[in-house]
């Protein structure tokens, strides 16, 4: 059974992940057209279901494409290097989802833009955090 200290650690990690994802989204939302139009041609795959920490496998598998987009479309005003940012996210995701059980991610048929993708995982984090508090 999870202890209060492990629950607190999970909550803090989720809050950190949430902040990282929100930071990326805020950066993208500051982009103007036609740059935003170009960025929205990148497609991301969404999980069929995302209600448990193990479902973070689906986020982990899309981190490489996310880094690629951020590298290619990086604004000179965006001071965090995409590689460092994604590396931080990857470490948190690996800790949160655990490595004991191998979970095969199932993706929805529809693809998503980077904005929809980030919003989906932001909502996921907020939802799990709310169940822990």
């Amino acid at each position: 059974a999870p202890t209060s200290s492990s629950t607190k650690k999970t909550q803090l990690q989720l809050e950190h992940l949430l902040l990282d994802l929100q930071m990326i989204l805020n950066g993208i939302n500051n982009y103007k057209n036609p740059k935003l139009t170009r960025m929205l041609t990148f497609k991301f795959y969404m999980p069929k279901k995302a209600t448990e920490l193990k479902h973070l496998q689906c986020l982990e598998e899309e981190l490489k494409p996310l880094e690629e987009v951020l590298n290619l479309a990086q604004s000179k005003n965006f001071h965090l290097r995409p590689r460092d940012l994604i590396s931080n996210i990857n470490v948190i995701v690996l800790e949160l989802k655990g490595s004991e059980t191998t979970f095969m991610c199932e993706y929805a048929d529809e693809t998503a833009t980077i904005v929809e993708f980030l919003n989906r995982w932001i909502t996921f984090c907020q939802s799990i955090i709310s169940t822990l508090t």
């Epitope: 982009y31 036609p34 740059k35 139009t37 170009r38 960025m39 041609t41 990148f42 497609k43 795959y45 494409p65 690629e68 987009v69 290619l72 479309a73 990086q74 604004s75 000179k76 005003n77 048929d109 529809e110 693809t111």
Partner: antibody, heavy 121, light 113 residues
């Protein structure tokens, strides 16, 4: 080996329909836009538009909108270009080409060998 | 649509000598926020499909010899071949991909003198 293989040459009459194909292999076909390029006899290259096989999202160049249809079957890693009613002016070589995860951020790095379409009465 | 204009139309070259092709766009292909210039160069050898030579202004595509180089500013671009070889003959095209629809230049035919 990453490659795109196109269907063979076609000879058609005006008013007939046609569907040509472009099969990808050696990479994650669903994750890359596939562009279509026309080359009329003795002329230059014209970008017709592009399709994302992962969800069949299509973008047509205004010059080709309503003239052709792009489609894809991701289960067999194949993209298609079709005409419902061919005209003599559709006579050309048609190429498919891989355009990366975004057709804005990547050049066309892999090309099919081309399909010659001849429309004549 | 962005219009891409190439010069010259035809370029007779001598093997071992340098050659350059120009391309001009009707509007800037530079995104100053990103620092990306959305211009590519393709070579279509006789009887073959086009092949990507240079992407995003100056990056050589995989397997492309280093005798090919791309340069330029917002609207004026150059493809240089430091020492032309017989296998370099064909039609060279520039292409913009900063704006929809993507557009090609009319092509420059390079042939051996």
């Amino acid at each position: 080996e990453v490659q795109l293989v196109q269907s063979g040459a076609e000879v058609k009459k005006p008013g007939e329909s046609l569907k040509i194909s472009c099969k990808g292999s050696g990479y994650g076909f669903t994750n890359y836009w596939i562009g279509w390029v026309r080359q009329m006899p003795g002329k230059g290259l014209e970008w017709m538009g592009t399709i994302y096989p992962g969800d069949s999202d299509t973008r047509y160049s205004p010059s080709f909108q309503g003239q052709v249809t792009f489609s894809a079957d991701k289960s067999i890693s194949t993209a298609y270009l079709q005409w419902s009613s061919l005209k003599a002016s559709d006579t050309a070589m048609y190429y498919c080409a891989r355009q990366g995860r975004s057709y804005y951020y990547f050049g066309m790095d892999v090309w099919g060998q081309g399909t010659t379409v001849t429309v004549s009465s | 649509d962005i219009v891409m204009t190439q010069t010259p139309l035809s370029l007779p070259v001598t093997p071992g000598e340098p050659a350059s092709i120009s391309c001009r766009s009707s509007q800037s292909l530079l995104d100053s926020d990103e620092g990306n210039t959305f211009l590519d160069w393709y070579l279509q050898k006789p009887g073959q499909p086009p092949q990507l030579l240079i992407y995003t202004l100056s990056y050589r595509a995989s397997g492309v010899p280093d005798r090919f180089s791309g340069s330029g500013s917002g609207t004026d671009f150059t493809l240089k071949i430091s020492r032309v070889e017989a296998e370099d003959v064909g039609v060279y095209y520039c292409m913009q991909r900063i704006e929809f629809p993507l557009t090609f230049g009319g092509g420059t035919k390079v042939e051996i003198k």
